[in-house]
């Protein structure tokens, strides 16, 4: 089936340059996942984005061009959640300690961890450099953004019977057409200024009745804080 060349993320839009200052690109010679800067030296990403060597790229907009605002920092520690399950993608979360502190400025800044779980209907911002085509491929150079609502856990579980754990939630549109996609993994879902989700999985991208599934960051705040404290 043909696809719309104007589709972004899938069905999103070009983010305004450096308007998502907490968004990072994980690079291993090429962009493979996203992530979120949560303090000067730590990034949250997805467990299934694990690689033994990662360069974290901050301040990026066009990942194919050096635009002058980038900070490239190697990972010093890569800590996947101890209960990560690669088959079910339960506990799909990972922490990356940077080898040096990021310089915080207007184009590189942190995002807050959640103080409450995501509420159904809340509008969130999803971003990443993943595939923008729901069928086939069209990888963007510039960061893509998508505004999407948190779906109820009931609708989420109905979309993926037996696959949704309490550590997952759905964001998106049951009618399809708008979603995160391959290459967006690990990236942020920010609702009301808090990092509520990490791009995790889905059945295809932007398919009807198959919304994106995200790691529920709220469930991991204690683990994140304890891990950072133990590795500082």
């Amino acid at each position: 089936a043909p696809f719309d060349d104007d589709d972004k993320i899938v069905g999103g839009y070009n983010c305004e340059e450096n308007s998502v200052p907490y968004q990072v690109s994980l690079n291993s010679g090429y962009h493979f996942c996203g992530g979120s800067l949560i303090n000067e030296q730590w990034v949250v990403s997805a467990g299934h984005c694990y690689k033994s060597r990662i360069q974290v790229r901050l301040g990026e907009h066009n990942i194919e061009v050096l635009e002058g605002n980038e900070q490239f920092i190697n990972a010093a520690k890569i800590i996947r959640h101890p209960q990560y399950d690669r088959k079910t993608l339960n506990n799909d979360i990972m922490l990356i300690k940077l080898s040096s502190r990021a310089v915080i400025n207007a184009r590189v800044s942190t995002i807050s961890l959640p103080t409450a779980p995501p509420a159904t209907g809340t509008k969130c911002l999803i971003s990443g450099w993943g595939n923008t085509a729901s069928s086939g491929a069209d990888y963007p150079d510039e960061l893509q953004c998508l505004d999407a609502p948190v779906l109820s856990q009931a609708k989420c579980e109905a979309s993926y019977p037996g696959k949704i754990t309490s550590n997952m939630f759905c964001v998106g549109f049951l009618e399809g057409g708008k979603d995160s996609c391959q290459g967006d993994s690990g990236g942020p879902v920010v609702c009301n200024g808090q990092l509520q989700g990490v791009v995790s999985w889905g059945d295809g991208c932007a398919q009807k009745n198959k919304p994106g599934v995200y790691t529920k960051v709220y469930n991991y705040v204690k683990w994140i804080k304890n891990t950072i404290a133990a590795n500082s």
């Epitope: 962009h31 997805a46 086939g136 491929a137 069209d138 990888y139 391959q182 290459g183």
Partner: antibody, heavy 127, light 108 residues
Framework: QVQLVQSGAEVKKPGASVKVSCKAS????????MHWVRQAPGQGLEWMGS????????NYAQKFQGRVTMTRDTSISTAYMELSRLRSDDTAVYYC????????????????????WGQGTMVTVSS | EIVMTQSPATLSVSPGERATLSCRAS??????LAWYQQKPGQAPRLLIY???TRATGIPARFSGSGSGTEFTLTISSLQSEDFAVYYC??????????FGGGTKVEIK
């Protein structure tokens, strides 16, 4: 081991149709996209289209739209490519090829390539 | 449609010598590029994916480099079994998936 085995050579008359099969073994058929590529005698490789064996969703090259149909039978792990209204310039070897890197649920980027190819099916169109 | 252009069309090299094959994309394909080897009467075989990662079982004498629009396949020391046709292919933006026209590596 992982392999794709295609049906045998075909000789067809102009205007006829041909259906080539590609049987997968050694892996989970529904977990990997299948593509079809052809090669005319002495020529390069030409992409025809793809099928997602899990959903049945297809993508066809514009050149073949309306003439090609890609289907699959998951019960026997087999993909099919049917080309109709054959012309003499459709004479070629037709290959099925699997895209490596499982069509996993996770949304990390994985580099794509055709890691497993069928042995090819020669289709000759001649009056 | 992204057009892939390979050069040269034919490369004459002596066994043991280095061969450098070029592939150019009409627009950026990032690192979404693969290289294949094809011998007469055989299906293509994957050599390199992600522009620079060797496929399973491919000898270290084959290496890929480049990103964006310019890519290179290097065979450091040609063996007799390396004389074949080599194709590049982009997976960055499809449909359609596109291949280069091929480079034939022949014995000098």
């Amino acid at each position: 081991q992982v392999q794709l085995v295609q049906s045998g050579a075909e000789v067809k008359k102009p205007g006829a149709s041909v259906k080539v099969s590609c049987k997968a073994s050694g892996y989970t058929f529904t977990g990997y996209y299948m593509h079809w590529v052809r090669q005319a005698p002495g020529q390069g490789l030409e992409w025809m289209g793809s099928i997602n064996p899990s959903s049945g969703g297809t993508n066809y090259a514009q050149k073949f739209q309306g003439r090609v149909t890609m289907t699959r039978d998951t019960s026997i792990s087999t993909a099919y490519m049917e080309l109709s209204r054959l012309r003499s310039d459709d004479t070629a070897v037709y290959y099925c090829a699997r895209v490596g890197g499982a069509a996993a649920a996770g949304k990390a980027y994985t580099a794509s390539a055709f890691d497993i190819w069928g042995q090819g099916t020669m289709v000759t169109v001649s009056s | 449609e992204i057009v892939m252009t390979q050069s040269p069309a034919t490369l004459s090299v002596s066994p043991g010598e280095r061969a450098t094959l070029s592939c150019r994309a009409s627009q950026s394909v990032g690192s979404n590029l693969a290289w294949y080897q094809q011998k007469p009467g055989q299906a293509p075989r994957l050599l390199i994916y992600g522009a620079s990662t060797r496929a399973t079982g491919i000898p270290a004498r084959f290496s890929g480099s480049g990103s964006g629009t310019e890519f290179t396949l290097t065979i450091s020391s040609l063996q007799s079994e390396d004389f074949a046709v080599y194709y590049c292919q982009q997976f960055h933006n499809w449909p359609p998936l596109t291949f280069g026209g091929g480079t034939k590596v022949e014995i000098k």
